[in-house]
Interface confidence: low
Amino acid sequence: SAPGEDEECGRVRDFVAKLANNTHQHVFDDLRGSVSLSWVGDSTGVILVLTTFHVPLVIMTFGQSKLYRSEDYGKNFKDITDLINNTFIRTEFGMAIGPENSGKVVLTAEVSGGSRGGRIFRSSDFAKNFVQTDLPFHPLTQMMYSPQNSDYLLALSTENGLWVSKNFGGKWEEIHKAVCLAKWGSDNTIFFTTYANGSCKADLGALELWRTSDLGKSFKTIGVKIYSFGLGGRFLFASVMADKDTTRRIHVSTDQGDTWSMAQLPSVGQEQFYSILAANDDMVFMHVDEPGDTGFGTIFTSDDRGIVYSKSLDRHLYTTTGGETDFTNVTSLRGVYITSVLSEDNSIQTMITFDQGGRWTHLRKPENSECDATAKNKNECSLHIHASYSISQKLNVPMAPLSEPNAVGIVIAHGSVGDAISVMVPDVYISDDGGYSWTKMLEGPHYYTILDSGGIIVAIEHSSRPINVIKFSTDEGQCWQTYTFTRDPIYFTGLASEPGARSMNISIWGFTESFLTSQWVSYTIDFKDILERNCEEKDYTIWLAHSTDPEDYEDGCILGYKEQFLRLRKSSVCQNGRDYVVTKQPSICLCSLEDFLCDFGYYRPENDSKCVEQPELKGHDLEFCLYGREEHLTTNGYRKIPGDKCQGGVNPVREVKDLKKKCTSNFLSPEKQNSKSN
């Protein structure tokens, strides 16, 4: 295992005294119920904590909630329940925090049964003050902020009305009835589905998709026979019922629904589903469920228009029961994703791609690990990562994999080493190169978090017993120090640090239990004195991402370019600081076949970079639907991977001709669309 507190590890000097001076306890004057925590704004230090306690009485449930505010990253809290008139807040709606640094907060109150509408409390000054507003409807969903303008809110009512506010919830207007699902698009556009006859459930597959670009003054019907819709990156997707049977197909639009193209994806039946796993402005990862209750499907990756898809990964685990998938975007390195597949023997194995789904491989076995009982060959096995599925199966896995964009290359996850994911107690593994190589970081399950852009990693052992010890590392998990943060152990419930991993504060949440009572308690530890000085140029080293063969001129080329990063040396104990910006130097690569996906009608045989024609399409004209017209594709089997920036080198031919024919199977052709005004 990774070296602990031994000769190899230089101890951080006097850390106990430094941390003791920066450990702040807060005991909440509450009976233990549930607690939720939200950060308000970025780098503001403002945290809101809502505690709720339910007392089931004979005829009703009595609820009590309290609201606390901190403006110093959780070191001190003030009870501000009086600002919301001591009202009971509905926890299922959470705290609706406004986008960016708007400082806006909406809390939804519990109201008595006979009331005309709901009640909200609004703040636009980072929760210093709240305004009570009675609503003309009962909300069904949390208030949703427009990403472009935090004064614009939308909500669905319990009677399926779509309500919009243009003045941050002060005044509300019902812009449409019979609405099933509503989402903000770009430029303050709202997309929503409506039912005509009975209900959302009864009309599934017969819904209409509408759009308003002026907050409900006018509408355009942009789709009919809709089952569902979704937004991902710059793509709008709709699953549409086929005319003749119960199957449905995905259609895609890149112009907010004005024109649609049928995605070249398999149609699905009643029991199957589509799922957008990840999307950016370049491309989409789409999961298509397999027929039957198999628990797996296929991942497809799209072209830059979201229309033509390549098969990326077979037997991708995605349970229909709980809707669990392990698909994880490794945000600390471009192009890297991790997920699980269900193998033929029904065991679950982890796969990783470094090139945005072009090729998937097993994770390399960590140097310092033995193969476990799942391995047929004790010398050859892989690392398998526990994610959402393991957590849903109640395995001893307290956290999903963790990566942060500003902690370059770092990935932390629970895992086991063998031929498949194991049900045995997992250990924690770390990669410092975006998933290429792994090391066992901690024995047994832990909670973990990244502070100061990777300068500090903090962990707490997952235990059923009360705890009072926190572990931290200043060298990306190689060496660990332990700090006893309280004499009286607490029942640990969670670690909280400011999103974005730039903070140096960590809050440990839990509760104390005595003979008669139990109370919420938090300990906030500031690591600023551990990292005494600001990092300088000498503390950083140049690192080439995706490097596998330094002798190769193309080493590090992924999606047509390579990137060199300045990364903190493991031996440097210093502050990256809140203003730290990842420094990277990109350089363009020559094009090779690796920069091209297989085109529609082509596939890559295993361990081959060449695309070959699908046998069932050999000799057939390759035709597909584009904007409701049939297109003819002339191709030698390749298309540029979306987002690939390579230049020169290999350049396969690709040409698309308009066949001037209508696609009969495109249900979202422009002539089926109409506009309405209020």
Epitope: E344, D345, N346, T374, G418, A420, V423
Partner: antibody, heavy 126, light 107 residues
Framework: QVQLVQSGAEVKKPGASVKVSCKAS????????MHWVRQAPGQGLEWMGS????????NYAQKFQGRVTMTRDTSISTAYMELSRLRSDDTAVYYC???????????????????WGQGTTVTVSS | EIVMTQSPATLSVSPGERATLSCRAS??????LAWYQQKPGQAPRLLIY???TRATGIPARFSGSGSGTEFTLTISSLQSEDFAVYYC?????????FGGGTKVEIK
């Protein structure tokens, strides 16, 4: 459709061996574990062991260890269970059953046994 | 090994009534539990897996609940074809073990 067809009834003397076959059809034989379960007259179900047709790996209940051998022939999608040194209390109906799951791998669903053979009656009598 | 205990051994119920069968594991099996129905002269039939998920083709009157060590199979309104022996089985660990069975008979 998915089915498991077992070999016919057997009458054996104490000390002998019996080999029961179970032919799978309608699904990928190597994709699912095959379990063997027996039921003595008027008694409950007793799990004997399982085989992973993909790797040939086996798991036997302690009680049958050393007496039971489970094998498979993937070319004809057939699993076999051989029980040696038979005693009169081995008289039972022996079932093969398709299952999903394993001790050490997190296998999707841990179904239990979703498809069963019709059963093979083995009578041990002198 | 994990010992599975079913109760009661016999349950007498009238058609149309509700039947509740219990199964207890000697240690936690999470939700890795299956229920089977067996009629005389027939092979067992999978009813419930994952403690609560009905197998394909099983009527909605059958429902499973529980997790850890305590599990319940409920038949909401007994039909004539439901009179049979019911077994629970843990599928969390080897050896897979069955409960002794509960016979549901006509009252």
């Amino acid at each position: 459709q998915v089915q498991l067809v077992q070999s016919g009834a057997e009458v054996k003397k104490p000390g002998a061996s019996v080999k029961v076959s179970c032919k799978a059809s309608g699904y990928t034989f190597t994709g699912y574990y095959m379990h063997w379960v027996r039921q003595a007259p008027g008694q409950g179900l007793e799990w004997m062991g399982s085989i992973n047709p993909n790797s040939g790996g086996t798991n036997y209940a302690q009680k049958f260890q050393g007496r039971v051998t489970m094998t498979r022939d993937t070319s004809i999608s057939t699993a076999y269970m051989e029980l040696s040194r038979l005693r009169s209390d081995d008289t039972a109906v022996y079932y093969c059953a398709r299952g999903v799951g394993s001790t050490v791998t997190l296998a999707y669903y841990y179904y239990g046994m979703d498809v069963w053979g019709q059963g093979t009656t083995v009578t041990v009598s002198s | 090994e994990i010992v599975m205990t079913q109760s009661p051994a016999t349950l007498s119920v009238s058609p149309g009534e509700r039947a509740t069968l219990s199964c207890r594991a000697s240690q936690s099996v999470s939700s890795n539990l299956a229920w089977y129905q067996q009629k005389p002269g027939q092979a067992p039939r999978l009813l419930i897996y994952g403690a609560s998920t009905r197998a394909t083709g099983i009527p909605a009157r059958f429902s499973g609940s529980g997790s850890g060590t305590e599990f319940t199979l409920t038949i909401s309104s007994l039909q004539s074809e439901d009179f049979a022996v019911y077994y629970c089985q843990q599928v969390a660990n080897y050896p897979r073990t069955f409960g002794g069975g509960t016979k549901v008979e006509i009252k």
